[in-house]
């Protein structure tokens, strides 16, 4: 169908709540394009009909509650005039529980899941809540080990626990809870956030934290395309280069020629204390000689790789 | 460093009252749930109910309903609990827990005995 | 409320020996489940936070886990100091309910 295909990363989510994945590949999504979304390689696309539990709203994919059953891969098309990307989204999840926030033994966690708060502060938790305009959410209400947080040291501003003088006793099993309302019903939105605390200055001292990748391999089929973001959290003050190599080259130096293979533009999101920078690498084609290779992310003195493996065959097609 | 410092040994007569205080230090007193719990002689342990010092907010055990009153003395970071109408079945090591992290730090105990 | 069933009662063991403990909640807490070690005359110490998290200074023989509705605490390897009573905590809801406790006595 001359659609290029393009895999990002896992995402985990929690069962019976609501979940919405925005599909922005930019700087595809930045003109004039379609984007229909799919499940499990089905050619029916997913409803835009707002009364459908899952359904497509823009450029989202929504699921008003999120179920067992939902787990899988969904793809969302992206045509352009002279273009076309499919981009592949494994959703994955797992049973969540009122008051269950220690998930901290589940893979490839995002860092929304993991905050840190510094000790002696004024620092903050986020709730991270991704979903389209049409979703309205209510105030957000703040648990620590299943009870509300309240006291003076403790103020919500939007999405953010604001905590003031941080302390050792901070640490712990956090949850965030909002309301979301979505054509006139209203659902339940719950996140568990494991706080632990650093006693050092800035966001880790001067060494950055690489997030993601976490030195694992990836399953990728030969002749796609594949994005893989570095995300890094660093002082704001730093001044550590970010970037990826192979075989202790620059990629974008080692594939000079061919250009196959390529170093993304950085980008970061700075918080208060802290900035969150991401730098992707790009896969045009995967070629046999890319397996086996660790690709490194580098941000100062860290360093962490993936590492591109075959998939498994399925024997099922026989 | 957290300590609870509880209140003396009591003994007391069926149908008097009790009041145990739980002095905390060590950490911001009125940020976190300060729960009671019971234990008999010989027995495994009981939550009575517990107390956020920042309102006063109280949350009680059905059983303790009535029986149980929980104060709190910001000045001096000190909880109480009043135990009522006291029958021998209420002798007991009372301990204070901080719910800095989920119950993390006891007092030392009081031990209240009822007899006549 | 929330009932924590504990087993066994009791138990003896010998030092070197592989202890385990478990807990069933009759429904789900998450993983808001923490282990006690209690001697006689002596507060409780917590050893275990949510189900698995080893409380700062607690030797790491002492482990946690979760099946279901279903916990369990292990000691790798008995040692002297261990022979006490253990408890399990839910705090998913109040009320907040204790296990009935095991004692870990010398064979």
């Known amino acids: 169908d001359g659609c290029k295909d393009i895999f990002m990363k896992n995402e985990i989510l929690s069962a019976s709540q609501p979940f919405a994945f925005n599909c922005t590949f930019p700087p595809i999504t930045s003109g004039e394009v379609s984007v229909t979304w799919y499940k499990n390689s089905s050619k029916i696309p997913v409803s835009k009909i707002i009364q459908s539990r899952i359904h497509q709203d823009e450029t989202w994919i929504l699921f008003l509650p999120m179920e067992w059953g939902d787990s899988g891969v969904y793809q969302c098309v992206i045509k352009g005039r002279d273009s076309c990307h499919r981009i592949h989204v494994n959703l994955t999840v797992f049973e969540k529980h009122w008051c269950d926030t220690s998930i901290g033994g589940l893979p490839n966690l995002s860092d929304e899941y993991k905050q840190i708060l510094h000790l002696g502060k004024d620092d903050s938790l986020t709730c991270h809540l991704h979903f389209p305009k049409s979703c309205v959410l209510g105030p957000i209400k703040w648990y620590k080990d299943c009870n509300e947080i309240k006291g003076e040291r403790f103020t919500v501003l939007e999405t953010r626990l604001l905590v003031s003088n941080v302390s050792a006793e901070d640490r712990g099993n956090y949850a965030c809870q909002a309301i979301l309302t979505h054509s006139g019903k209203q659902y339940e939105v719950l996140n568990g956030i494991t706080v632990s605390i650093t006693e050092r200055a800035g966001y880790g001292g001067s060494v950055p934290k690489i997030i993601y990748p976490k030195n694992h391999s990836i399953e990728v089929q030969l002749g796609t395309t594949l994005i893989v973001d570095c995300n890094v959290t660093d002082t704001k003050d730093n001044t550590n280069l970010r970037c990826w190599r192979v075989n202790n080259t620059l990629v974008d130096d080692y594939y000079d020629e061919s250009k196959r293979i390529r170093e993304g533009v950085e980008t970061h999101v700075s918080f208060r204390e802290h900035n969150l920078y991401t730098v992707n690498i790009t896969f045009l084609e995967v070629k046999m000689e890319d397996y086996g290779l660790p690709f490194m992310c580098h941000a100062g003195v860290s360093t962490a790789y993936i590492i591109l493996q075959l998939p498994a065959p399925d024997f099922r097609a026989y | 460093q957290v300590q609870l410092v509880q209140s003396g040994a009591e003994v007391k007569k069926p149908g008097a009252s009790v009041k145990v205080s739980c002095k905390a230090s060590g950490y911001y007193f009125t940020s976190y749930w300060m729960n009671w719990v019971r234990q008999a002689p010989g027995q495994g342990l009981e939550w009575m109910g517990m107390?956020?010092?920042?309102?006063?907010?109280?949350r009680l055990a059905q059983k303790f309903k009535g029986r149980v009153t929980m104060t709190v003395d910001k000045s001096t970071s000190t909880v109480y609990m009043e135990l009522s109408s006291l029958r021998s079945e209420d002798t007991a090591v009372y301990y204070c827990?901080?719910?800095?992290?989920?119950?993390?730090?006891w007092g030392q105990g009081t031990l209240v005995t009822v007899s006549s | 409320d929330i009932q924590m069933t504990q087993s066994p009662s009791s138990l003896s063991a010998s030092v070197g020996d592989r202890v385990t403990i478990t807990c069933r909640a009759s429904q789900d807490i998450g993983n808001a489940l923490n282990w006690y070690q209690q001697k006689p005359g002596k507060a409780p110490k917590r050893l275990i936070y949510?189900?698995?998290s080893l409380d700062p200074g607690v030797p790491s023989r002492f482990s946690g886990s979760r099946s279901g509705t279903d916990f369990t605490l292990t000691i790798s390897s008995l040692q002297p100091e261990d022979f006490a009573t253990y408890y399990c905590l839910q705090y998913a809801s109040s009320p907040y309910t204790f296990g009935q406790g095991t004692k870990v006595e010398i064979k």
């Open positions: 949510a189900t698995s």
């Open positions: 827990a901080s719910s800095t992290t989920a119950f993390a730090y």
């Open positions: 107390i956020h010092p920042y309102d006063s907010e109280t």
